[in-house]
């Protein structure tokens, strides 16, 4: 009874299409598959950034797989052939592993790469990234930013650089069609007459770095002798109402400070008839239903009422 064996896939490689971290892993079928013509061969692929403790594992019938990686580090991958038990009268058969690695040869010392990269997607409309030049680099050093996300044919360079002393220190991006809820890849590389400059790679999702505008049209309405309803409107722009969380700060008579976090554009406040002054501010943030993270907006303009019994008025800013 001869032991069934299968070869590993051939020509296993990691291909960089120039998408700043989105790589193709591809391979060819193993040699000598003739005995298994009726069989659907599968492949188990494992890959990770070098230094990561865990492998990502994929089982596929295809001859390729695509995923995003951190190009600041190397990438290692391995693959073997799987013959399912239906083909082998009993147990699954696995080939030995084929292995490959990929890394971008780093130029320049790490200190030359950009420092303190910070990106904010203002009001889910305008992306702005800023950075500081590398440590000890000369003024002749300039940095260039490239970006890519799925849907673009190729990586694009920044259209509008922000400059300081002639050096690029930031980028205002053009509009980004259908760019949220997917990985957004950035590379900032550099050039200098004097020494090579280390490139930096960044990956994030735009919906997770949104800083909304503050809420507008803050109003008070007396609901009853001991309740006041605070209301406001969602900020102007493309973010739907269902995506907001709000934080309110309320100050009564210069003493009591109430803070609360709410999901809609109203908050009912218990008050006493003695309340002479009431002020509140609100800020907004994209909530967990629309993003995994976000940045609080600035506080709204303060809305106050003082000097008259709050029960006598509906107050509108």
């Amino acid at each position: 009874d001869t032991e069934i064996k299968v070869n590993p896939p051939q020509d296993f490689e990691i291909v960089d299409p120039g998408y700043l971290g989105y790589l193709y892993l591809q391979w060819q079928p193993p040699l000598s598959l003739d005995h298994f013509k009726e069989c659907t061969v599968e492949y188990e692929l494992k890959y990770r950034n070098i230094g990561s403790e865990t492998w990502k594992t994929i089982i596929t019938k295809n001859l390729h797989y695509k995923d995003g990686f951190d190009l600041n580090k190397g990438i290692e991958a391995k693959i073997h052939t799987l013959l399912p038990w239906q083909c082998t009268n009993g147990s699954e058969v696995q080939s030995s592993w084929a292995e490959t690695t990929y890394w971008i040869s780093p130029q320049g010392i790490p200190e030359t790469k950009v420092q303190d990269m910070d990106c904010v997607y203002y009001n889910w409309q305008y992306l702005l990234c800023s950075w500081k030049p590398g440590i000890g680099v000369l003024l002749d050093t300039n940095y260039n930013l490239f970006y890519w996300y799925e849907g673009l044919d190729h990586a694009l360079q920044c259209v509008d650089y922000i400059k300081a002393d002639g050096q690029n220190i930031g980028c205002r991006f053009p509009y980004l069609e259908a760019s949220d809820y997917k990985d957004f890849y950035i590379c900032v590389n550099g050039s200098s007459e004097n020494k090579p400059i280390r490139s930096s790679y960044f990956t994030f999702q735009l919906q997770n770095i949104v800083k909304p505008l503050p809420p507008v049209y803050l109003t008070f309405t007396r609901e009853s002798s001991c309740e006041i309803k605070l209301k406001w409107s969602i900020p102007l722009g493309p973010i739907p109402a269902r995506c907001f969380d709000y934080e309110i700060e309320i100050r009564e008579d210069d003493t009591t400070l109430v803070t609360a976090t709410v999901e809609n554009e109203t908050y009912t406040l218990k008050t006493t008839n003695e309340t002479r002054q009431l002020c509140f501010v609100v800020r907004s943030k994209v909530n967990i239903y629309c993003s995994a993270d976000g940045i609080w907006s600035e506080w709204s303009d303060k809305q106050c009422w003082e000097g008259e019994d709050l029960s006598k008025k509906t107050l509108l800013r």
Epitope: Y122, Y126, L128, D153, L156, Q157, V159, D160, I162, K163, A164, I169, G170, R172, F173, P174, Y175, L213, E298
Partner: antibody, heavy 119, light 111 residues
């Protein structure tokens, strides 16, 4: 809520200078470029230049290089344009207008300051 | 400098009909896969208002009856259906390179 406030009018003598202001509110001042545009009665719009409040970087239309100086005061979210050696050719409405980079166009405009150069 | 030539200089269109204004650039205003062409509406005594940016994208709060198209050197602004409130001057403007330049304008009126 975005507002660009400009004084309504300025009357100046020929040969004098004038400093026009544009006070911005309702947005993060340093995130947007500020443009200045000239419009004479019944004439085309002329782009004078733009300043980036983030870093003070300025691009001028060469036709206005010796005429206009653009500055900003980030602490008061105000952009300024100083016009010098004024002649009757400089009588016009001057608009400030914000834009987020070159691909977005100029999305909010001030109401304009009418400058009249007359003795 | 990039010269923008608008045509026609004036146009009268019946209510509900289509108005088309053209803008031709002396050289391509395309770069980075973007057409840096914008359209503005201006009414007497008012500042210009952004209608279209990047050739075809609508400005904030602009009615859907305004649309832009084109690439390279040839662009057009379409208004359909024409409404009374659309009587105004219309300008094209390029932001591909400094100095930004405007077209000479098209005066649109009701027929």
């Amino acid at each position: 809520q975005v507002q660009l406030q400009q004084p309504g009018a300025e009357l100046v003598r020929p040969g004098a200078s004038v400093k026009l202001s544009c006070k911005a509110s309702g947005y993060t001042f340093s995130n947007y470029l500020m443009n200045w545009v000239k419009q004479r009665p019944e004439q085309d719009l002329d782009w004078i230049g733009r300043i980036d409040p983030y870093d003070g970087d300025i691009d001028y239309n060469q036709n206005f290089k010796d005429k206009a100086i653009l500055t900003v005061d980030k602490s008061s979210s105000t952009a300024y344009m100083q016009l010098s050696s004024l002649t009757s050719e400089d009588s016009a409405v001057y608009y400030c207008a914000r834009g987020y980079g070159t691909a977005y166009g100029v999305d909010y405009w001030g109401q304009g300051t009418s400058v009249t150069v007359s003795s | 400098d990039i010269v923008l030539t608008q045509s026609p200089a004036s146009l009268a269109v019946s209510l509900g009909q289509r108005a088309t204004i053209s803008c031709r650039a002396s050289e391509s205003v395309d770069n980075y896969g973007i057409s840096f062409m914008n359209w503005f509406q201006q009414k007497p005594g008012q500042p210009p208002k952004l209608l279209i940016y990047a050739a075809s994208r609508q400005g904030s709060g602009v009615p859907a009856r305004f649309s832009g198209s084109g690439s390279g050197t040839d662009f057009s602004l379409n208004i359909h259906p024409m409404e009374e409130d659309d009587t105004a001057m219309y300008f094209c403007q390029q932001s591909k390179e400094v100095p930004w330049t405007f077209g000479g304008g098209t005066k649109l009126e009701i027929k």
